[in-house]
Interface confidence: low
């Protein structure tokens, strides 16, 4: 190889060892039979050399630095050449460095031809191995503007006082042009301006100077976004830190065309603007930091550009002003991540503050809109607490558990509406009365409605799930001892049409000791399946539940258990079941941890089934499934 650098070219070439690989045989640069591991060639020098191995690219890297002095003479503006040409260089990983020094009053602009640049964060690398590292200068301090790959949106970077651009090319890359030009501009009066151009839908992730380290103190950095007028842009902060300010406040400022309040000033912790039409600027302003404990200011953010959706022009009013202790969250439904670009899906408050999820609280009227390509990507979860603190005031009081119509009118599917029902301990209990009798969901008779009620204890230490219930069954009411949560969960968009079938009333009633009592009024010729709470996990220790089963005068009920033994093994106490005729009070008692479960039995009158658990050994839980079937009494039961 021969490298000859013209006099006055201000170019230095350095060949040095890269990160050594685990290769057995070392490699050297050979000049006049001398073996060396580093070679420096300066302007005006001509050197002939070879390598002592077949694959020098595994050992060495080459750096070509050109110093451009715009302080003492005219600046060579225009397209930047790769000098020496890559064809004259050995095939090593190579880095071309241009170090431009200029006066503070001169602005320098790097213009990148297509493909434009894409900024990458720490630990990221470029797919083709070609990276652009750009830094600026504040007095004598070097400031890293960022590291960039090809195929992005960054078209221009403006700086003043000097710029250092390093283009890294892997040894195998055929590129033979720099891909950028330098132009002079008037002073930009800030650290830098980065221009990002969107031709269509897409996203860009950008970072403050020096990221992930601290942004220079009291500096200003601007990003200019060029967005077609028919598209919408949204900004979201992925990561930020605030430093400790002594004077002034760290902030971001937006210049949004058409806004009457330019510049719009936001704190970094604020929700950032969304749904912006056309071009806009974003500036990051630092502060004077505390000398003793400066901390660091840093910011990583994403700009998402997409088509406006029909919904983005519609405003929905969610009136929660008359509600208490209620929160409504609109959020993305869980999906498998796809690798291709997926347009963002945002919900916007007052059309401007957009984010992927939004929580609205009671006591106010909220105006929301959507910036989303497909609203089925979102769902709603609502929580409402109904609590009674004074048992004398609440007793016999009733509340309707109904989804407010304002919520049903939103164009987003309701997933869960949870009511947390709280009562004073050992003072009151609760009764749930549905508008339509309920069916308990079982494997044998699953619910196939568009929604169900999930009833569970709301006492933190108690793991008790009563079950999932849907309209169209035989359960007339459910009484529970203490705090519960009732969740209306929807399973199909058709819930909107079936919403009229929902309706549950809760009443506060005098306290009773049993964990739950189900009142069952079976319909003729239908088999009612019932199962103990906490199915699959077992009825909790020392818990008692009952079923009050009505048998009409002209009917007989057949009670059937679906296994021979309960399977429970008690560590302490006894598990038992009582079947009691309500008219005669006659009862049968079965020891569930010892006896065989009863064979199918026939009941001519209403009866109770009560199941009480012991403290079972782990793995030997109490789970019972039984059914009740009515048949006319005229049938010969023998």
């Amino acid at each position: 190889f021969e490298i000859a650098l013209p006099r006055e070219s201000n170019i230095t070439v350095l060949i040095k060892l890269g990160t050594p690989t685990l290769l057995a045989k070392p490699c050297y640069i050979v000049i006049s039979k001398r073996h060396i591991t580093m070679l420096s060639i300066k302007s005006g020098e001509r050197i002939v050399f070879t390598f002592s191995c077949q694959s020098p690219e595994n050992h060495f890297v080459i750096e070509i630095q050109k110093n451009i002095d715009c302080m003492s003479g005219p600046c060579p503006f225009g397209e930047v050449q790769l000098q020496p040409s890559t064809s004259l260089l050995p095939t090593l990983n190579r880095t071309f460095i241009w170090d431009v020094k200029a006066h503070k009053s001169i602005g320098l602009e790097l213009q990148f031809s297509i493909p434009r640049l894409r900024q990458i964060g720490p630990g990221e690398s470029c797919p083709d191995g070609v990276t652009h590292s750009i830094s600026g200068r504040i007095d004598a301090t070097v400031v890293r503007i960022g590291t960039f790959c090809s195929n992005g949106t960054v078209s221009r970077i403006k700086m003043q006082e000097g710029v250092k651009m390093a283009l890294h090319l892997p040894w195998f890359h055929p590129r033979n042009v720099s891909g950028f030009s330098i132009a002079n501009r008037s002073s930009i009066k800030r650290l830098c301006i980065i221009e990002s151009v969107f031709e269509g839908e897409g996203s860009a992730t950008l970072m403050s100077a020096n990221y992930p380290e601290g942004f220079p103190e009291d500096e200003l950095m601007t990003w200019q976004f060029v967005v077609p007028a028919h598209l919408r842009a949204s900004v979201s902060f992925l990561n930020f830190n605030l430093s400790n300010c002594e004077r002034k406040e760290e902030r971001v400022e937006y210049y949004i065309p058409g806004s009457t309040t330019n510049p719009e000033v936001f704190k970094l912790e604020d929700k950032q603007p969304g749904n912006m039409a056309g071009n806009f600027n974003l500036s990051l302003q630092g502060c004077d930091q505390d000398a003793q404990s400066p901390g660091i200011l840093r910011l990583q953010f994403q700009v998402l550009v997409q088509h406006p959706q029909n919904e983005s022009n519609k405003i929905y009013v969610v009136d929660l002003s008359n509600e208490r202790a209620m929160s409504l969250t609109i959020e993305p439904r869980p999906v498998k991540q796809s690798r291709k670009f997926v347009p963002g899906c945002f919900v916007c408050l007052e059309s401007r503050t957009c984010s992927s999820n939004l929580t609205l609280t009671s006591g106010s009227k909220h105006k929301i809109s959507f910036l989303c390509d497909d609203l089925t990507r979102l769902w709603m979860n609502v929580e409402k607490t109904i609590s009674c603190t004074d048992h004398r005031y609440c007793q016999r009081k009733s509340y309707s558990l109904q989804v407010p119509s304002d919520i049903l009118h939103l164009p987003v599917e309701l997933h869960d509406f949870s009511w947390k029902l709280l009562v004073p301990k050992d003072r009151l209990s609760l009764v749930l009365v549905p508008a339509q009798k309920l069916q308990q969901h079982t494997h044998e008779k699953p619910c196939n409605t568009s929604f169900s009620y999930l009833v569970a204890s709301a006492i933190p230490s108690q793991d008790l799930y009563f079950g999932s219930f849907c309209p169209g069954g035989s359960i007339k009411q459910i009484q529970v001892k203490q705090n519960i949560s009732v969740t209306l969960r929807t399973f199909a968009p058709s819930f909107q049409q079936e919403a009229s079938r929902q309706g549950l009333t809760v009443s506060f009633i005098p306290y009773f000791k049993e964990e739950g009592v189900f009142t069952v009024t079976p319909d003729t010729k239908s088999k009612v399946y019932l199962r103990t709470p906490n199915w699959d996990r077992g009825l909790p220790s020392l818990t008692s539940v009952s079923w009050n089963i009505s048998v009409p005068r002209d009917q007989v009920a057949c009670l059937t258990f679906f296994k021979e033994r309960s399977g429970v093994v008690c560590q302490t106490g006894r598990a038992f079941m009582i079947i009691q005729e309500q008219r005669t009070r006659a009862e049968e008692i079965f020891s569930l941890d010892e006896d065989v479960l009863p064979k199918p039995s026939f009941h001519h009158h209403s009866f109770w089934v009560n199941i009480s658990n012991c403290s079972p050994t782990s793995g030997k839980q109490l789970d019972l499934l039984f059914s009740v079937t009515l048949t006319p009494r005229t049938v010969d039961l023998t």
């Epitope: 990160t19 720490p122 630990g123 690398s125 890293r144 992930p212 380290e213 912790e269």
Partner: antibody
Framework: EVQLVESGGGLVQPGGSLRLSCAAS????????MHWVRQAPGKGLEWVAS????????SYADSVKGRFTISADTSKNTAYLQMNSLRAEDTAVYYC?????????WGQGTLVTVSS | DIQMTQSPSSLSASVGDRVTITCRAS??????VAWYQQKPGKAPKLLIY???SLYSGVPSRFSGSRSGTDFTLTISSLQPEDFATYYC??????????FGQGTKVEIK
């Protein structure tokens, strides 16, 4: 296979120095944050220092700032913790860990005892 | 600095129990919270990262969730090998990284 092996621990007097090493294999430390985390006997985990060698980025817990120095030799694929002016409260098992989203690989730890 | 307040500091449970450990961040840390398991004399092991992502090779009985600045680690059905100390950690800020005080899960 990713592996981290710490060494250099031992008994040292208050005011003394030690240098811990963390030899990494199965990955390139340049592409990851490397951390030192310590655990005093019977106590919880305490972050000590971090390095991101690609950008020469280092950071330290307040309790060790000015006394400990984290460094990395990417050619040896090894991270180091130079500990000076050691105090009794620095007695702990010192773990080295790498992270991306979180600390996914840890070494087995090396015990540092500071006692007179 | 961000504090991670972990509770409870210890708990007794039986095999098969559902166990919940919570961590509250003193300020927003987005979803940058990880959970680790540590057994006596051993290095910690990563269970959950980014608040709810299960690390490869970790049994699915472990799960993580986030509600604002509250983070929860749940073991749906405690197994004999799960008796250990659990730590949460925020990685939102590279400096300083902070761990919770730890929760020791003991056999009842």
């Amino acid at each position: 296979e990713v592996q981290l092996v710490e060494s250099g621990g031992g008994l040292v007097q208050p005011g003394g120095s030690l240098r811990l090493s963390c030899a990494a294999s199965g990955f390139n430390i340049s592409y990851y944050y490397m951390h030192w985390v310590r655990q005093a006997p019977g106590k919880g985990l305490e972050w000590v220092a971090s390095i991101y060698s690609s950008s020469s980025y280092t950071s330290y817990a307040d309790s060790v700032k000015g006394r400990f120095t984290i460094s990395a030799d990417t050619s040896k694929n090894t991270a180091y913790l130079q500990m000076n002016s050691l105090r009794a409260e620095d007695t702990a098992v010192y773990y080295c860990a790498r992270s991306y989203y979180a600390m996914d690989y840890w070494g087995q730890g090396t015990l540092v005892t500071v006692s007179s | 600095d961000i504090q991670m307040t972990q509770s409870p500091s210890s708990l007794s449970a039986s095999v098969g129990d559902r166990v919940t450990i919570t961590c509250r961040a003193s300020q927003s840390v987005s979803s940058a919270v990880a959970w680790y398991q540590q057994k006596p004399g051993k290095a910690p092991k990563l269970l959950i990262y980014s608040a709810s992502s299960l690390y490869s090779g970790v049994p699915s009985r472990f799960s993580g969730s986030r509600s604002g600045t509250d983070f929860t680690l749940t073991i749906s059905s405690l197994q004999p090998e799960d008796f250990a100390t659990y730590y949460c950690q925020q990685s939102y800020y590279v400096y300083p990284i902070t761990f919770g005080q730890g929760t020791k899960v003991e056999i009842k």
